[in-house]
């Protein structure tokens, strides 16, 4: 990292995070429900460093501390035994006395159905309790309405975590976004992301969070912060002595002219080295290419083909001038 | 260490439009935000808008109705137009780097004076 | 808006002295997102302090920086020459960025 600290938790330093931040990076919000009773009711400034409410996640509110846990905000799971929204039922009373829903055939009792707070309509880690008619939410501080949708939270609150920039509407009540530093996302910039994961690297590139800073490393014949740039691979890359530039790959060759190899075609190549003329044939080098001079027996440009003993070759008839056994241009 | 170099033209004719390009020495346009800033002489610090590859941008309420920051991966640049400019935009404009840990500014350009002038 | 003011406008003081200079905000700047910045003549502004309190690569420790809330103070512990100059205080925590008239140190 450039910079002194590697993660936002140092800048804080000392300092008391604002509300309602709290834990060592100050991201975790301090609830009643969910905390020690030392921060008292509501929402209190925690200090990072004494990990002062360095609580549980926040639970739904209501959710019983003795019978109920969580592994997400706003959520309540029951330990074996207990059931219901807040796992305040057991489940031996609660699988017979249900007021509602039909009987079962094999025990007898009375099948729970669904109720107006199964599945917890309360957003925000709002508690939700059965009304006659229906039901109610209660919001956790900074969220109203029927189902705590709605979030009471402005920029004047500080929501913004992990470095981001909190923008508000038009008028200072009005709703916020937080605008996240690379590296971060969610409404209040608190989770950290993999920004590998969303494979932002294209072309096969290589990937690699630096936490600061994302890189993609490109294959060959590509570039671009995001590799998204194939190269004209033959692009700056003549090829000498005549030779042509193919393309391919993400990288270049070229195909040589005759007598000269190597990447570029720099190297001066001997035609005859790879012994092209078959049958016996012996090679000479031409300057316009290699030429053969078949063995008595065989004609065609590499001696390749036998003539026949009555005098037929097994080609078409000889090109006009060119006498079978007479040396032949290979072009 | 990144550098960047403003560029544009020194002076513009009032009610034109200024065009500024920054450009980052770098392959890591698409890894911070970039921002504008200016500073007219003898006066203090004035953000103007900033912008990140995704295309998330934010413009200063005082100048949003005639800003745009756009920025282009492929070149390692960003701009900034500024229309209808008056004898108030004449200043020092600097393009920054937003520091990684939140909206301060670590890498500045050395600054391009814009004058507004017929 | 968070408009930014700084106190004093000018700082005379000659070079070994402890200079304190302060940036109060109108409103509450949240999670202490506030950034130092020094300027010389002629230069663009180098970023000295952020988060209040930390220090940017390549600082030296005779800078620091304190406060929370709406007070915010950064203390050059001993002027050296080069720290004759304009400093400035930003605020980063809700949009839009602003930045404080600045404080000039000048040579007593």
């Known amino acids: 990292y450039p910079y002194d600290v590697p993660d936002y938790a140092g800048m804080l330093g000392s300092a008391r995070c604002e509300p309602p931040a709290v834990g060592t990076a100050c991201t975790r919000l301090c609830r009643p429900r969910s905390a020690p009773s030392r921060c008292g009711p509501g929402l209190r400034p925690c200090a990072p460093l004494e990990d002062e409410c360095e609580a549980p996640l926040v639970c739904r509110a209501g959710c019983s501390p003795e019978h109920g846990f969580c592994e997400q905000p706003g959520e309540c799971r029951c330990l074996e035994g207990w059931t219901g929204p807040l796992c305040t039922v057991p489940v031996s009373t609660s699988s017979c006395l249900s007021p509602r829903g039909p009987s079962s055939a094999t025990t007898g009792c009375l099948v729970p159905g669904p109720g107006p707070c199964d599945g917890n309509p309360c957003a925000n880690g709002g508690s939700c309790s059965e009304t006659p008619r229906s039901f109610e939410c209660t919001c956790p501080r900074g969220f109203y309405g029927l189902r705590c949708e709605v979030s009471g939270v402005t920029c004047a609150d500080g929501p913004c975590f992990n470095g981001g920039l909190c923008v508000g509407g038009a008028d200072p009540d009005s709703a916020y976004i937080c605008h996240c530093p690379p590296g971060f996302q969610g409404s209040n910039c608190e989770k950290r992301v993999d920004r590998c994961s969303l494979q932002p690297c294209r072309n096969g590139g290589l990937c690699l969070d630096l936490g600061h800073a994302l890189r993609c490393r490109c294959r060959a014949g590509f570039a671009g912060p995001r590799c998204e740039h194939d190269l004209d691979d033959c692009a700056g890359r003549a090829c000498a002595n005549g030779g042509t530039c193919v393309e391919g790959g993400g990288a270049h060759r070229c195909s040589c002219a005759l007598g000269f190899g190597g990447r570029d075609c720099r190297e001066r190549a001997d035609p005859c080295a790879a012994r092209p003329c078959a049958h016996g044939g012996r090679c000479y080098a031409h300057f316009s290419g290699l030429v053969c001079a078949c063995a008595p027996g065989y004609m065609g440009a590499r001696c390749e083909f036998p003539v026949h003993p009555d005098g037929a070759s097994a080609l078409p008839a000889a090109p006009p001038g060119l006498r079978p056994g007479d040396p032949q241009r290979y072009l | 260490q990144v550098q960047l170099q403003e560029s544009g033209p020194g002076l513009v004719k009032p009610s034109e439009t200024l065009s500024l390009t920054c450009t980052v020495s770098?392959?890591?346009?698409?890894?911070?935000?970039w921002s504008w800033i200016r500073q007219p002489p003898g006066k203090g610090l004035e953000w103007i808008a900033y912008i990140y590859y995704s295309g998330t941008t934010n413009y200063n309420p005082s100048l949003k109705s005639r800003v745009t920051i756009s920025l282009d991966t492929s070149k390692n640049q960003f701009s900034l137009q500024l229309s209808s400019v008056t004898a108030a935009d004449a200043a020092v404009y600097y393009c920054?780097?937003?520091?990684?840990?939140?909206?301060?500014?670590?890498?500045w350009g050395q600054g391009t004076m814009v004058t507004v002038s017929s | 808006e968070i408009v930014l003011t700084q106190s004093p406008g000018t700082l005379s003081l000659s070079p070994g002295e402890r200079a304190t200079l302060s940036c109060r905000a109108s409103?509450?700047?949240?999670?202490?997102?506030l950034a130092w910045y020094q300027q010389n003549p002629g230069q663009a502004p180098r970023l000295l302090i952020y988060?209040?309190?930390s220090r940017a690569t390549g600082i030296p420790d005779r800078f620091s920086g304190s406060g929370s809330g709406t007070d915010f103070t950064l203390t050059i512990s001993r002027l050296e020459p080069e720290d004759f100059a304009v400093y400035y205080c930003?605020?980063?925590?809700?949009?839009?960025?602003?930045f404080g008239g600045g404080t000039k140190v000048e040579i007593k």
């Open positions: 930003q605020q980063y925590g809700t949009s839009p960025l602003t």
């Open positions: 988060g209040a309190s």
């Open positions: 770098d392959n890591s346009i698409s890894n911070y935000y």
């Open positions: 920054a780097r937003v520091f990684h840990w939140g909206f301060a500014f670590d890498i």
């Open positions: 409103q509450r700047v949240s999670n202490t997102y």
